[in-house]
Interface confidence: low
C-alpha cells in the first residue's frame, strides 16, 4: 500500500489529524521534500547575519554576514570578524602579522614567507606583512650564456617594506 503522505508535495505537510490531508506549511516554515509530517522552522538571519535568500514554503532562508564579517562553517553557520590584509584574528582581536609572516586576505592566519634559499633561489621581492616573498632564479641560472634575466636585487634577509 502506498503511503498517502507520499503525495504531499514540498511546501506542505501531511496532517495526521485530518486524514492525511496535505496542509500548507505555517508561516515562517518550509518543507523541502514531499511526504513530510511537519514543517521545519525557517532560519532567521539576525544580528551579524544578513539575509541572502528569503525563506519560502519549499526552501530555507540563506544567510551571509554583514560587511566587516565573513562566513565560516557549512551554510554560513558563523560570522567571523574581518581583519585587514597583513593581520590575523586572535582572541584579542586583529593583530599585525609577526615578522616573517604575511596574510594577503581579510580572513585566515598569517603564513610564513617562502624561504627562497631552501630551493637554492635568491629573493627577488622581499616579503611584507601583506605579501609573500618572491623568489628569483638561482645564482647558477644567472651564469654567462644563460638566457637573459633582470638580475635580482642583492640577496639579503627579507624584511618588511618601510611602512
Amino acid at each position: 500500500l502506498q503511503d498517502p503522505c507520499s503525495n504531499c508535495p514540498a511546501g506542505t505537510f501531511c496532517d495526521n489529524n485530518r486524514n492525511q490531508i496535505c496542509s500548507p506549511c505555517p508561516p515562517n516554515s518550509f518543507s523541502s521534500a514531499g511526504g513530510q509530517r511537519t514543517c521545519d522552522i525557517c532560519r532567521q538571519c539576525k544580528g551579524v547575519f544578513r539575509t541572502r535568500k528569503e525563506c519560502s514554503s519549499t526552501s530555507n532562508a540563506e544567510c551571509d554576514c554583514t560587511p566587516g564579517f565573513h562566513c565560516l562553517g557549512a551554510g554560513c553557520s558563523m560570522c567571523e570578524q574581518d581583519c585587514k590584509q597583513g593581520q590575523e584574528l586572535t582572541k584579542q582581536g586583529c593583530k599585525d602579522c609577526r615578522f616573517g609572516t604575511f596574510n594577503d586576505q581579510k580572513r585566515g592566519i598569517c603564513q610564513p614567507w617562502t624561504n627562497c634559499s631552501l630551493d637554492g633561489k635568491s629573493v627577488l621581492v622581499n616579503g611584507t606583512k601583506e605579501s609573500d616573498a618572491v623568489c628569483g632564479p638561482s645564482p647558477a641560472d644567472l651564469s654567462p650564456g644563460a638566457s637573459s634575466v633582470t638580475p635580482p636585487a642583492p640577496a639579503r634577509e627579507p624584511g618588511h617594506s618601510p611602512q
Epitope: C5, F13, D15, N16, N17, S23, P26, S32, G35, Q36, R37, T38, C39, D40, I41, R43
Partner: antibody, heavy 117, light 107 residues
Framework: QVQLKESGPGLVAPSQSLSITCTVS????????INWVRQPPGKGLEWLGV???????NYNSALKSRLSISKDNSKSQVFLKMNSLQTDDTARYYC???????????WGAGTTVTVSS | DIQMTQTTSSLSASLGDRVTFSCSAS??????LNWYQQKPDGTVKLLIY???SLHLGVPSRFSGSGSGTDYSLTISNLEPEDIATYYC?????????FGGGTKLEIK
C-alpha cells in the same frame, strides 16, 4: 503504534551533566520534530527545545547555553544533554513528537531527574 | 519571549457542569495555540490545536475558541475522567511557551 520512551540517570550531582535518551517507534525522525519539555515538582510545563526533521534545533532562550539536542535517525533516538545542573533542574523530563502545525501530538511518559549531592 | 498566563490556578466544578479555562498571551499569537491535558499520573495528551481544531480521538465535549491574545478551552459536560491539569501553549514565536496550568477538581 507510535511511542516515545525517555531514559535517564535518575540522580545527578550538582554541577554535573545530564544525558537523556528518547527512543521512538512507529514513525521516522526524518519526518517529525521532537520536542523536550520538563516539569519541576508541583510546577507547570516548560518547553526546553526542538529538534527538527532536517536536524536543526531551537532552544528555550533561558537554557540555550546549557542545552544540546541531537539524534541518531538510524537508531530512532534523540538525545538531550544539559550541562552545569543545579537543584532547580530537578524535574520530570518529557519528549514529545512535533507534528503538523507544531502541536505535540504524542508524549512519552517522562523520566524523573533529581539533582542532589 | 511570549508570556502565557492562565490566571486561575485551580477550578472546582461538579460532574455535568460546563467548565471554561482561560489563557492570555502577552502579545497577539494569531490563533497559534494548543491545549494539553495532564492527568494526575503525569500522562500528557493533546486536546486542541490551532485554537479550535479537535485532536483525533478527543471527545466532542471539548472545544476551543479565541483570537488575538485571549483564548479559552471549554468542557461542555464534565466527566470524572476529565479531572486533570490543563495547559495552553503558543507556537506563534519561538521559544514556544506554556501557560502555568489550571487544575480541575470535582466538587
Amino acid at each position: 503504534q507510535v511511542q516515545l520512551k525517555e531514559s535517564g540517570p535518575g540522580l545527578v550531582a550538582p554541577s554535573q551533566s545530564l544525558s537523556i535518551t528518547c527512543t521512538v517507534s512507529g514513525f521516522s525522525l526524518t519526518s517529525y520534530a521532537i520536542n523536550w519539555v520538563r516539569q519541576p515538582p508541583g510546577k507547570g510545563l516548560e518547553w526546553l527545545g526542538v529538534l527538527w526533521p532536517g536536524g536543526g534545533t531551537n532552544y528555550n532562550s533561558a537554557l540555550k547555553s546549557r542545552l544540546s539536542i541531537s539524534k541518531d535517525n538510524s537508531k530512532s533516538q534523540v538525545f538531550l544533554k544539559m550541562n552545569s545542573l543545579q537543584t532547580d533542574d530537578t524535574a520530570r523530563y518529557y519528549c514529545a513528537r512535533g507534528s503538523g502545525t507544531w502541536y505535540f501530538d504524542v508524549w512519552g511518559a517522562g523520566t524523573t531527574v533529581t539533582v542532589s549531592s | 519571549d511570549i508570556q502565557m498566563t492562565q490566571t486561575t490556578s485551580s477550578l472546582s466544578a461538579s460532574l455535568g457542569d460546563r467548565v471554561t479555562f482561560s489563557c492570555s498571551a502577552s502579545q497577539g499569537i494569531s490563533n497559534y495555540l494548543n491545549w494539553y491535558q495532564q492527568k494526575p499520573d503525569g500522562t500528557v495528551k493533546l486536546l486542541i490545536y490551532y485554537t479550535s481544531s479537535l485532536h483525533l480521538g478527543v471527545p466532542s465535549r471539548f472545544s476551543g475558541s479565541g483570537s488575538g491574545t485571549d483564548y479559552s478551552l471549554t468542557i461542555s459536560n464534565l466527566e470524572p475522567e476529565d479531572i486533570a491539569t490543563y495547559y495552553c501553549q503558543q507556537y506563534s514565536k519561538l521559544p514556544w511557551t506554556f501557560g502555568g496550568g489550571t487544575k480541575l477538581e470535582i466538587k
